[in-house]
């Protein structure tokens, strides 16, 4: 249960640097595991809790995407033709786009076990935690699933396809006024 999760991340007290330090134990082990679903509501299933992306600061998330996340997605896809994969995942508005982005980025899927430790994923998680009210607490409460990153990352074709879908979702997120095709 939640107590076990919090027990695994207890904070130790230390003195240091004239200020104060309290270090989270096994902080890299903290992650999230949610079921992979597609919703058009802007809600993310999280056990019995649904995260609603409606109140996020979309402009600041967009700025983070344009300045850095987009570049990391391109780096991940380097060596892949832009026409190689068809976009099969779509979103209708900004909250819905973030729901799909969250789902594809952090939920394990068949053939692509985890993208969560990729740089674009870490930055996505940071952006959501900072600019989506209450999002960080849902991550603290979430079931621990993301284990420490392996030394060697395996990029499967399925993962490339998934990241290609993510690029499409992010592009759609940046153009919310466009009519759905």
């Amino acid at each position: 249960g939640l107590n076990d999760i919090f027990e695994a991340q207890k904070i130790e007290w230390h003195e240091g640097g004239g200020g104060s330090e309290q270090k989270l134990i096994s902080e890299e082990d903290l992650g999230s595991s949610h079921h992979h679903h597609h919703h058009s509501s802007g809600l993310v299933p999280r056990g019995s809790h649904m995260y609603d992306f409606t109140n996020c600061d979309f402009e600041k998330i967009k700025a983070a995407y344009l300045s850095t996340i987009s570049k990391d997605l391109i780096t991940y896809m380097s060596g892949t033709k832009s026409t190689e994969f068809n976009n099969t995942v779509s979103c209708s508005n900004r909250p819905h786009c973030l729901t799909e982005i969250q789902s594809l980025t952090f939920n394990p899927t068949a053939g692509c076990a985890s993208l969560a430790k990729e740089m674009f994923a870490m930055k996505t998680k940071a952006a959501l935690a900072i600019w989506c009210p209450g999002y960080s607490e849902t991550q603290i409460n979430a079931t621990q699933a993301m284990k420490k990153a392996r030394k060697s990352k395996v990029t499967t074709n399925k993962c490339l396809e998934q990241v290609s879908q993510l690029q499409g979702l992010w592009r759609r997120f940046n153009r919310p006024l466009l009519k759905q095709q």
């Epitope: 104060s20 940071a126 603290i140």
Partner: antibody
Framework: QVQLVQSGPEVKKPGSSVKVSCKAS????????MHWVRQRPGQGLEWMGT????????DYNQNFKGRATITADKSTSTAYMELSSLRSEDTAVYYC?????????????WGQGTLVTVSS | EIVLTQSPGTLSLSPGERATLSCRAS??????VHWYQQKPGEAPRLLIY???QSISGIPDRFSGSGSGTDFTLTISRLESEDFAVYYC?????????FGTGTKVEIK
């Protein structure tokens, strides 16, 4: 061991600027945002803003927008907070504090504080 | 901006007594509240995070509870080193804000 070491006390004239530094060590700098919090004499804590090294961006409390500039030098793991157009009400202790952006999400380490005195 | 109001402003108690500190948010913030202790001339020290989560190294006489808009920090039996100022903080949304503070003083 995690340490946040801030620069020393400053005495400034009204209308001038001050730049306070916060050198971090003992952890991966980009895994944490660096927040700045100030405390006027005998008063409570006031969040000023943050720099998020992972995203290379800042965010501010509107009360300080335009006067505060929060930056960082990732190569030296040092964060900076510059406050311009100083007035006597800016006399305060300024703290830096780290907060995880992909885990923990709480200010679990603080600098020792930097006293800035604004006086003519 | 979310306003956090702490009460009482000052709590005068004797060592060994129970202290109950309140923090009320101007809007629901689920469990995104943390508690800090501050002594004169020192930086704040994290005591409780996400409303009720305890921290190793912090005595278990400190406990937190609440969700939504009402939060409580309880010190079950006051020790001499517990006399200080206590602040609640919300990280539900930017700008992050702190409570007005409660001073726990020796009666």
């Amino acid at each position: 061991q995690v340490q946040l070491v801030q620069s020393g006390p400053e005495v400034k004239k009204p209308g001038s600027s001050v730049k306070v530094s916060c050198k971090a060590s003992g952890y991966i700098f980009t895994d944490y945002a660096m927040h700045w919090v100030r405390q006027r004499p005998g008063q409570g804590l006031e969040w000023m803003g943050t720099f998020i090294p992972l995203l290379d961006t800042s965010d501010y409390n509107q009360n300080f927008k335009g006067r505060a500039t929060i930056t960082a030098d990732k190569s030296t793991s040092t964060a900076y907070m510059e406050l311009s157009s100083l007035r006597s009400e800016d006399t305060a202790v300024y703290y830096c504090a780290r907060m995880g952006v992909t885990h923990s999400y709480v200010m679990d380490a603080w600098g020792q504080g930097t006293l800035v005195t604004v006086s003519s | 901006e979310i306003v956090l109001t702490q009460s009482p402003g000052t709590l005068s108690l004797s060592p060994g007594e129970r202290a109950t500190l309140s923090c009320r948010a101007s809007q629901p913030i689920s469990i995104s509240v943390h508690w800090y202790q501050q002594k004169p001339g020192e930086a704040p020290r994290l005591l409780i995070y996400f409303a009720s989560q305890s921290i190793s190294g912090i005595p278990d006489r400190f406990s937190g509870s609440g969700s939504g808009t009402d939060f409580t920090l309880t010190i079950s039996r006051l020790e001499s080193e517990d006399f200080a100022v206590y602040y609640c903080q919300q990280t539900f949304s930017l700008p992050y804000t702190f409570g007005t503070g409660t001073k726990v003083e020796i009666k």
